[in-house]
Amino acid sequence: QQQTLPKPFIWAEPHFMVPKEKQVTICCQGNYGAVEYQLHFEGSLFAVDRPKPPERINKVQFYIPDMNSRMAGQYSCIYRVGELWSEPSNLLDLVVTEMYDTPTLSVHPGPEVISGEKVTFYCRLDTATSMFLLLKEGRSSHVQRGYGKVQAEFPLGPVTTAHRGTYRCFGSYNNHAWSFPSEPVKLLVTGDIENTSLAPEDPTFPADTWGTYLLTTETGLQKDHALWDHTAQNLLR
């Protein structure tokens, strides 16, 4: 006999990266007929919702009107049908951005290079931080993590035209509190590629990470729950 129900999906709308003082909705999708949903924050009960009528609802929303560092962290949810509880969802890492300062992003040898040249991004932030994140805009979003006292290096290695695009970086004060985004740096890669072994090795997510970050909740954009959960896990771990 089944002792638990399947775990629900958890995600954030419009995004798990939330600018300070902006609103965010944490969504939990379980099964029709669930009489209670619980949202847990850092391992403790945070909020409860009892959908009405339960047989017509399989998703609940927990609204945070004013994001701040105290609300940033790891969330999970569970639901109950009758007396039977579900497995907990995967962890959702909710990040507050636009904290404190703005890093500076630069690229060496320059913003325009020839395919095959080695390229390194530098993200610098003079305030107390040791972790930095480099994000590439576009449908195929690349995320890299780097460390340093005031500056982190992000070596891309020999670049191809696939590395073309606009990059931004964040300083991270902890796993869930990030700085303002840097000004964008546009990397242009010219030249035909003869060596196909130069394909980029960055992790790729099939969604527009930065574009979604810029969206507001008014768009009501629905994201693929599993994808965003997966993105958050990769980015923050």
Epitope: P109, G110, I114, K118, L188
Partner: antibody, heavy 118, light 107 residues
Framework: EVQLQQSGPELVKPGTSVKISCKTS????????MHWVKQSHGKSLEWFGG????????SYNQKFKGKATLTVDKSSSTAYMELRSLTSEDSAVYYC???????????WGQGTTLTVSS | DIVLTQSPATLSVTPGNSVSLSCRAS??????LHWFQQKSHESPRLLIK???QSISGIPSRFSGSGSGSDFTLSINSVEPEDVGVYYC?????????FGPGTKLELK
């Protein structure tokens, strides 16, 4: 020690072609792009173009469109620039220069003097 | 194309004095500006990278400053061997361009 050794001076006739070489040593040839810079007598420096030995990718200054072809021979760690349809305007000193990925042109060849005259 | 303008065209200086050479870009190039020295009958030599970063082996009397479109190369206490032409170079975008140069000579 990093060295860029260029081929000797050339005296050629108008309308012909010439191929200048730049033999490198002291570093991994494929890790740095190689660029070519023109300096007419008593004038400033003009970037002709660059090539990445790693990929064969090239970038040319459109001002000199069709004038040059950049190639490399990885087996001998040598870069080449072929100049065609030469005129007296092409008479100059041509430098090869390595572009460091953490700065700019950090090592230069000694220059090759090209004289185009009938 | 990014056009670099250098001033003055010629600079006459007494050894031991300090000088400043100017380079102005036709558009903002952040700090992607490099300085070269070329002595007579020699190849150019990289002096300063990224507007203000020093190069190993270059005397400390050479320093750079500026960002955006206005840049300065300073030589603190000029030595006789500093005679030559000084070029700034745009490292921001292709085509990579050089300024027309500033000729440094001794009085």
């Amino acid at each position: 020690e990093v060295q860029l050794q260029q081929s000797g001076p050339e005296l050629v006739k108008p309308g012909t072609s010439v191929k200048i070489s730049c033999k490198t040593s002291g570093y991994t040839f494929t890790e740095y792009s190689m660029h070519w810079v023109k300096q007419s007598h008593g004038k400033s420096l003009e970037w002709f173009g660059g090539i990445s030995p790693n990929s064969g990718g090239t970038s040319y200054n459109q001002k000199f469109k069709g004038k040059a072809t950049l190639t490399v021979d990885k087996s001998s760690s040598t870069a080449y620039m072929e100049l065609r349809s030469l005129t007296s305007e092409d008479s100059a000193v041509y430098y090869c220069a390595r572009r460091d990925f953490h700065s700019s042109f950090d090592y230069w060849g000694q220059g090759t003097t090209l004289t185009v005259s009938s | 194309d990014i056009v670099l303008t250098q001033s003055p065209a010629t600079l006459s200086v007494t050894p031991g004095n300090s000088v400043s050479l100017s380079c102005r870009a036709s558009q903002s190039i952040s700090d992607y500006l490099h300085w070269f020295q070329q002595k007579s009958h020699e190849s150019p030599r990289l002096l300063i990278k990224y507007a203000s970063q020093s190069i190993s082996g270059i005397p400390s009397r050479f320093s750079g400053s500026g960002s955006g479109s206005d840049f300065t190369l300073s030589i603190n206490s000029v030595e006789p061997e500093d005679v030559g032409v000084y070029y700034c170079q745009n490292g921001h975008s292709f085509p990579l361009t050089f300024g027309p140069g500033t000729k440094l000579e001794l009085k």
